[in-house]
Amino acid sequence: VAKKKDKVKKGGPGSECAEWAWGPCTPSSKDCGVGFREGTCGAQTQRIRCRVPCNWKKEFGADCKYKFENWGACDGGTGTKVRQGTLKKARYNAQCQETIRVTKPCTPKTKAKAKAKKGKGKD
């Protein structure tokens, strides 16, 4: 049985879309069950009903799981440090990046060290 679609068309009449980009299925309550998925194509948007199977949510937890390297050194210029993650496991329908970069602010201690190192270099 076809599920009802909530369509919001922003394109002109008869405008055709070659490729829709769909966001994740977001359950209406809790972390699984019936929800909605939003799609965009050019100026058009569409909202459709979808379902996140509860057993999948339990099995996978996060859509994309990464294995991370150690944090890099503190960048004194930006006050941040970086580490890279490589995809370890994805939920079957999750379109995960193969690698991701995560940044975070340096702790005051490492920031001070980075500044001191920079200062030494200028002497």
Epitope: E19, R49, Q97
Partner: antibody, heavy 117, light 107 residues
């Protein structure tokens, strides 16, 4: 790019188990679901199950729960599918395919398993 | 289990014509529908994923539509190398299932 190379054709007598291998090269083998699909002569495609190499999580089609066993060997980037007590109706080409929702999939060339007395 | 019904079973066309292949799901599967092409003695080849997403290396004449229960694969202008069997597959729930296939043959 991922290349999947499967083991050669097998001829087995009914009841004698058979193990098909699927060796991956190229991109990371351990990050993607490995599907197993079969195709009987002149028929359509039938999904057997899948396994994730990172933790060996396996999801089997209930139809094959007592028939197929899926395993992986991370050290050699190889996936295996073992058919226990095969019968003549298990004669088919068996395919492995590595799935990523982001980039699509890559398939092995297929392994013909013939079960005949 | 989700049943996928493909139609027509056989489609006879001449090169240059437009092909419309249909796949209907027994319940809503969102956009979790993929299209494969298979030629004799070859493994299936993914043409379209998630109803309408294109695949690197696949000619632009192949396009897909959805989501919901009714899906279509369109070949805008059939080339001689497109004559093959086409399968749809759903990945919305276990077990993953395939449609019975549509054979595209030369008229």
């Amino acid at each position: 790019q991922v290349q999947l190379v499967q083991s050669g054709a097998e001829v087995k007598k009914p009841g004698h188990s058979v193990k098909v291998s699927c060796k991956a090269s190229g991109q990371s083998f351990s990050s993607y679901w490995m599907n197993w699909v079969r195709q009987a002569p002149g028929q359509g495609l039938e999904w057997i199950g899948m396994i994730h190499p990172s933790d060996s999580e396996t999801i089997l089609n209930q139809k094959f729960k007592d028939k197929a066993t899926l395993t992986v060997d991370i050290s050699t980037s190889t996936a295996y599918m073992e058919l226990s007590s095969p019968r003549s109706e298990d004669t088919a080409v068996y395919y492995c395919s590595s799935w990523s929702a982001k980039r699509g999939d890559f398939w092995g060339q297929g392994t013909l398993v013939t079960v005949s007395s | 289990e989700i049943v996928l019904t493909q139609s027509p079973a056989t489609l006879s066309l001449s090169p240059g014509e437009r092909a419309n292949l249909s796949c209907r799901a027994s319940e809503s599967i969102s956009n979790n529908l993929h299209w494969y092409q298979q030629k004799p003695h070859q493994a299936p080849r993914l043409l379209i994923k998630y109803a309408s997403q294109s695949i690197s290396g696949i000619p632009a004449r192949f396009s897909g539509s959805g989501p919901g229960t009714d899906f279509n694969l369109t070949i805008s202008s059939v080339e001689p190398e497109d004559f093959a069997v086409y399968y749809c597959q759903q990945s919305n729930s276990w077990p993953l299932t395939f449609g019975g296939g549509t054979k595209l043959e030369i008229k």
